[in-house]
């Protein structure tokens, strides 16, 4: 090929929109952290586009991502956590876009886990729990939750609950009785880290009781 | 105008500790790096610590590790260098820098001298 043809290549390359976003995940297995980017227009030919990442890493000057289907990622030990890096869009070593970002404030957590709803009778609640792998992390511990429950008949009517713990509360006497419900959760960074919700747990399903009338109630 | 100003430097017995401090002027000081460097006579300059933005993460050389704590107060816009075992070989000024952007400290203080006699 010529390199009269590479140039134009270029020159094409050049009037694209190659807008990307990114997000990190913090020691994602064991010491290992991640980088994830894609391209903000999804019909971008990515034929022949790179990524690569430099500054604020240890040992190293430049990491290259690997390349997925669409999306572009790097696992490794290597990222400083301190300081700006340069993540780059690149074509034939030249760069065509490039964004400065500290990869502590562009952090994904993992999605919670293990949801699960027990009804208290001699309460009249349900007690909301689930799991985070972030307990166990030394970095992203500090985490804020948003529970959202819907009556599974209301499509889009979630009601939401933020908390920083990993346990909740529904009083009964807020929810229909004798009603299915759908509830789910995800996190995002609080306090020393910055970024981006999580993936939504799996849902968990619970019917509500119907309500018992005391004797000498009347229907 | 001086944007980064050190201070708490001073004669020191080997064994004793000193707190340094660099107050920032520059206004993204609560969301850029800040380090410690420090340069002995006749060396280069050499790093000591470095804190995020935060302060949730940290990286010391080996040569301060366990000895040095590297800390910052971002509503002071502060960044602190505590320091003991303080040794001989820990003479020199010693300079904090500002916003890690690529590998480059965009912005360095005057340095404050810290001497530590046997």
């Known amino acids: 090929e010529s390199g009269y043809a590479q140039n134009g290549d270029l020159e094409d390359a050049e009037l694209d929109d190659y807008s990307f976003s990114c997000y990190s995940q913090l020691e994602v297995n064991g010491s290992q952290h991640s980088l994830t980017c894609a391209f903000e227009d999804p019909d971008v030919n990515t034929t022949n586009l790179e990524f690569e990442i430099c500054g604020a890493l240890v040992e190293v000057k430049c990491l290259s991502f690997r390349k997925l289907q669409e999306i572009y990622f790097i696992e490794t030990k290597k990222f400083l956590l301190i300081g700006k890096s340069n993540i780059c869009v690149k074509v034939g070593g030249k760069s065509l876009t490039c964004k400065k970002i500290d990869l502590t404030t562009i952090v994904k957590p993992e999605a919670p886990f293990d949801l699960s709803v027990i009804y208290r009778e001699g309460a009249n609640d349900f007690v909301v729990t689930f799991n985070t792998s972030h307990l166990q992390k030394k970095y992203v511990k500090v985490l804020m939750h948003d529970v959202a429950y819907r009556q599974e008949k209301d499509e889009n009517k979630w009601m939401h609950v933020n908390l920083s713990s990993t346990k909740l509360t529904l009083l009964q006497r807020n929810l229909q009785p004798e009603a299915m419900y759908e509830i789910k959760v995800r996190s995002i960074p609080d306090h020393y880290f910055k970024g981006f919700w999580s993936e939504w747990s799996p849902s968990y399903y619970f019917r509500t009781p119907e309500i018992n009338n005391s004797p000498g109630e009347m229907d | 105008e001086v944007q980064l100003v050190e201070s708490g430097g001073g004669l020191v017995q080997a064994g004793g500790s000193l707190r340094l401090s660099c107050e920032s002027s520059?206004?993204?000081?609560?969301?850029?790096?800040m380090g410690w460097f420090r340069q002995a006579p006749g060396k280069e300059r050499e790093f000591l610590a470095a804190i995020g933005w935060s302060g949730a993460v940290t990286h010391y050389s080996d040569s301060v590790k366990g000895r040095f704590t590297i800390s910052r107060d971002n509503a002071k816009n502060t960044v602190y260098l505590q320091m003991n075992s303080l040794r001989a070989e820990d003479t020199g000024r010693y300079y904090c820098?500002?916003?890690?952007?690529?590998?480059?400290?965009?912005?360095w203080g005057q340095g404050t001298q810290v001497t530590v006699s046997s």
């Open positions: 820098a500002e916003d890690y952007d690529t590998d480059v400290w965009q912005y």
């Open positions: 520059i206004s993204t000081f609560s969301s850029d790096a």
